[in-house]
Amino acid sequence: MMTGTIETTGNISAEKGGSIILQCHLSSTTAQVTQVNWEQQDQLLAICNADLGWHISPSFKDRVAPGPGLGLTLQSLTVNDTGEYFCIYHTYPDGTYTGRIFLEVLESSVAEHGARFQIP
């Protein structure tokens, strides 16, 4: 059991061609965040480093924008973007915290945002 908790945007949906913000928030710890990695399955999308700033993986540069904050904006969504996304917080001295978001990209305009939930 780790000290802190990660709150995420949870299960979310968005329209094909649109954009979505992936957001995580680490709370209940005094640990310092040195880096946040954003991953889709095992693929690294982006890194936000406390010293070096943002780095977007070259293969996602056209469709991924940094922020707001430590979050990530996905643009020009396709059905293939449906799946799990992970925010990985590297902190000291706590170690690594991971949050999970499931995104469903819909063909229709019936896209709703899911409720927020907590991952211990």
Epitope: Q32, A50, D94
Partner: antibody, heavy 122, light 107 residues
């Protein structure tokens, strides 16, 4: 097998700056999952945490050493260093570098260098 | 800062003895307590992390227990190579702090 090796002068004069380097082999200092640490042990005494650094340069140091400590990182050489300014005889110790790991909550120090004795004397 | 207090500071024991070392934190550190063994002239070696998890390659005669403020390192049957100094360390918060050490000597 990960190895850490400390290097630097064994004798430093009072009021000068102690400089040590830790060279990491068998693994990358740029690993996102690990932090790198300096610990010291005065002769015949216990262990004292000096500070910890991330590959990107974020540092955490012991407030008891005030602002005397800096821990630079050189990822191109797979090294991190310790610079301790305005040293006195009380800084005489064996200095160890270590890795923070494995990938568990609030990780311990799992790999250590063999240590190097630094004596502060005129 | 979190103070770590070890007891005893030294003990004498014989090969085959069961040895218990205690470590007390000045405030709750959950289970974020690690144990190290150090032999003269050598670097410390990680034995136990997260209070009770055995580090890879460490003999099963070493075990750890406890949570909150009170922790124990037990050597079930002391071997000749176990004569050394043992340190506890909290990784709950910075500054990271160590106990003063317990020297295990031959009786």
């Amino acid at each position: 097998q990960l190895q850490l090796q400390e290097s630097g002068p064994g004798l430093v004069k009072p009021a000068e700056t102690l400089s040590l380097t830790c060279t990491v082999s068998g693994g990358s200092i740029s690993s996102y999952d690990h932090y790198w640490t300096w610990i010291r042990q005065p002769p015949g005494k216990g262990l004292e945490w000096i500070g910890t650094v991330y590959y990107s340069g974020s540092t955490f140091h012991n407030p008891s050493l005030k602002s005397r400590v800096t821990i630079p990182v050189d990822t191109s050489k797979n090294q991190f260093s310790l610079k301790l300014s305005s040293v006195t005889a009380a800084d005489t110790a064996v200095y160890y570098c270590a890795r923070v790991g494995p990938d568990v909550s609030h990780p311990p120090f799992d790999y250590w260098g063999q240590g190097t004795l630094v004596t502060v004397s005129s | 800062d979190i103070q770590m207090t070890q007891s005893p500071s030294s003990l004498s024991a014989s090969v085959g003895d069961r040895v218990t070392i205690t470590c007390r934190a000045s405030q709750s550190i959950s289970s974020y307590l690690n144990w190290y063994q150090q032999k003269p002239g050598k670097a410390p070696k990680l034995l136990i992390y997260a209070a009770s998890s055995l580090q890879s390659g460490v003999p099963s005669r070493f075990s750890g227990s406890g949570s909150g403020t009170d922790f124990t390192l037990t050597i079930s049957s002391l071997q000749p190579e176990d004569f050394a100094t043992y340190y506890c360390q909290q990784s709950y918060s910075t500054p990271i702090t160590f106990g003063g050490g317990t020297k295990v000597e031959i009786k």
